[in-house]
């Protein structure tokens, strides 16, 4: 069920309409639910989830990650810088979410829902951001070649890539959720 359409909202017609922050919060939690379902399938069909961090670190994926310089941590917190980082990071994740689309059998719809919900989240956040000029959009040509390269990997590497994308995306969303609630 997409955010804002669950039974709780139906049962409470007197509830105030969701604020922008509440909508974003709910959207992130909805995407995290989807990731959780996808991770279940991934972990059930391969042993990637038990792999050590060291082995995972060898993979050379350039997945977005929150760092102190991004202004999302308590020390050096900067709302606008942080918002730009969150949006930029989500835009960078889009190519990896596209890669996930053909990686699931029983959770195919869930993978699509995560991808589409992320697009909606980006739109919500862009409305909140003041400095849209600072947001760099990934180059489509670079994304296309990256996608081709990822899809050409052997089965083991594709499983590893899937696991890494889900784990990193979950962590990025959690860091974003934490920062957005401080705003």
């Amino acid at each position: 069920v997409p955010p804002g359409e669950d039974s709780k909202d139906v049962a409470a017609p007197h509830r105030q309409p969701l604020t922008s922050s509440e909508r974003i919060d709910k959207q992130i939690r909805y995407i995290l639910d989807g990731i959780s379902a996808l991770r279940k399938e991934t972990c059930n069909k391969s042993n990637m989830c038990e792999s050590s961090k060291e082995a995972l670190a060898e993979n050379n994926l350039n997945l977005p990650k929150m760092a102190e310089k991004d202004g999302c941590f308590q020390s050096g917190f900067n709302e606008e810088t942080c918002l730009v980082k969150i949006i930029t990071g989500l835009l960078e994740f889009e190519v990896y979410l596209e890669y996930l689309q053909n990686r699931f059998e029983s959770s195919e719809e869930q993978a699509r829902a995560v991808q589409m919900s992320t697009k909606v989240l980006i739109q919500f956040l862009q409305k909140k951001a003041k400095n849209l000029d600072a947001i760099t959009t990934p180059d489509p040509t670079t994304n296309a070649s990256l996608l081709t390269k990822l899809q050409a990997q052997n089965q083991w590497l594709q499983d590893m890539t899937t696991h890494l994308i889900l784990r990193s995306f979950k962590e990025f969303l959690q860091s974003s959720l934490r920062a957005l609630r401080q705003m």
């Epitope: 995290l32 929150m66 941590f73 784990r167 979950k170 962590e171 959720l177 934490r178 609630r181 401080q182």
Partner: antibody, heavy 119, light 106 residues
Framework: QVTLKESGPTLVKPTQTLTLTCSFS??????????VGWVRQPPGKALEWLAF???????YYSPSLESRLTITKDTSKNQVVLTMTNMDPVDTATYYC??????????????WGQGTLVT | DIQMTQSPSSLSAFVGDGVTMTCWAS??????LNWYHQRPGEAPELLVF???NLQIGVPSRFRGSGSETYFTLTINSLQPEDSGTYFC?????????FGGGTKLEI
């Protein structure tokens, strides 16, 4: 099984620095969504949140005590350390460390240490 | 900072009774509200997280509800072991704050 245990001095003189260690097992502080917090409770009074450290080393402090507190983690040793400078008799309390671990960051403390009384 | 206010500060009831205690937040905290139970000389124990989700192992006679600024914890069919102090805590953002507690005597 998740467990946490606080250790440190039971008696501290005024103006001294208190150093408390939280040793834990059954979870990793490098897993996203996981954090460890410190909470204190003066005798017969309510709970007071002090500090919190996340898996990615982001740290938060109680505004009223921020200048006196430092929280650090050693992931390899499964330990979190809280230091509190310039101790005063009003800081007499039972000090607890507690774990928070959920996907949506509700900051709910699902497992607590037994607590250590500091006078 | 978000302030948490609990009411009543104390109450007494008999085994088998039902009681309700409330917790108010000074601003909207969505459903980021947790409830704890503490017996004398013991560490607090998480009962309810996210306003209405029972922690694993907590009896179903406990029920949390509410959203935004108003929350309640209801205990049906009170048992002797339910005595102690109940604290609410918001988990919306930092700084985290606890309510002053509701002391329950059975």
């Amino acid at each position: 099984q998740v467990t946490l245990k606080e250790s440190g001095p039971t008696l501290v003189k005024p103006t001294q620095t208190l150093t408390l260690t939280c040793s834990f097992s059954g979870f990793s502080l490098s897993t996203s969504g996981v954090g460890v917090g410190w909470v204190r409770q003066p005798p017969g009074k309510a709970l007071e949140w002090l500090a919190f450290i996340f898996w990615d080393d982001d740290k938060y402090y109680s505004p009223s005590l921020e200048s006196r507190l430092t929280i650090t983690k050693d992931t390899s040793k499964n330990q979190v350390v809280l230091t509190m400078t310039n101790m005063d008799p009003v800081d007499t309390a039972t000090y607890y460390c507690a774990r928070s671990a959920d996907d949506y960051l509700y900051y709910s403390f699902d497992t607590w240490g037994q607590g250590t009384l500091v006078t | 900072d978000i302030q948490m206010t609990q009411s009543p500060s104390s109450l007494s009831a008999f085994v088998g009774d039902g009681v309700t205690m409330t917790c108010w937040a000074s601003q909207s905290i969505n459903d980021y509200l947790n409830w704890y139970h503490q017996r004398p000389g013991e560490a607090p124990e998480l009962l309810v997280f996210a306003a209405s989700n029972l922690q694993i192992g907590v009896p179903s006679r406990f029920r949390g509800s509410g959203s935004e600024t108003y929350f309640t914890l209801t205990i049906n069919s009170l048992q002797p072991e339910d005595s102690g102090t109940y604290f609410c805590q918001h988990g919306h953002s930092f700084p985290l704050t606890f309510g002053g507690g509701t002391k329950l005597e059975i």
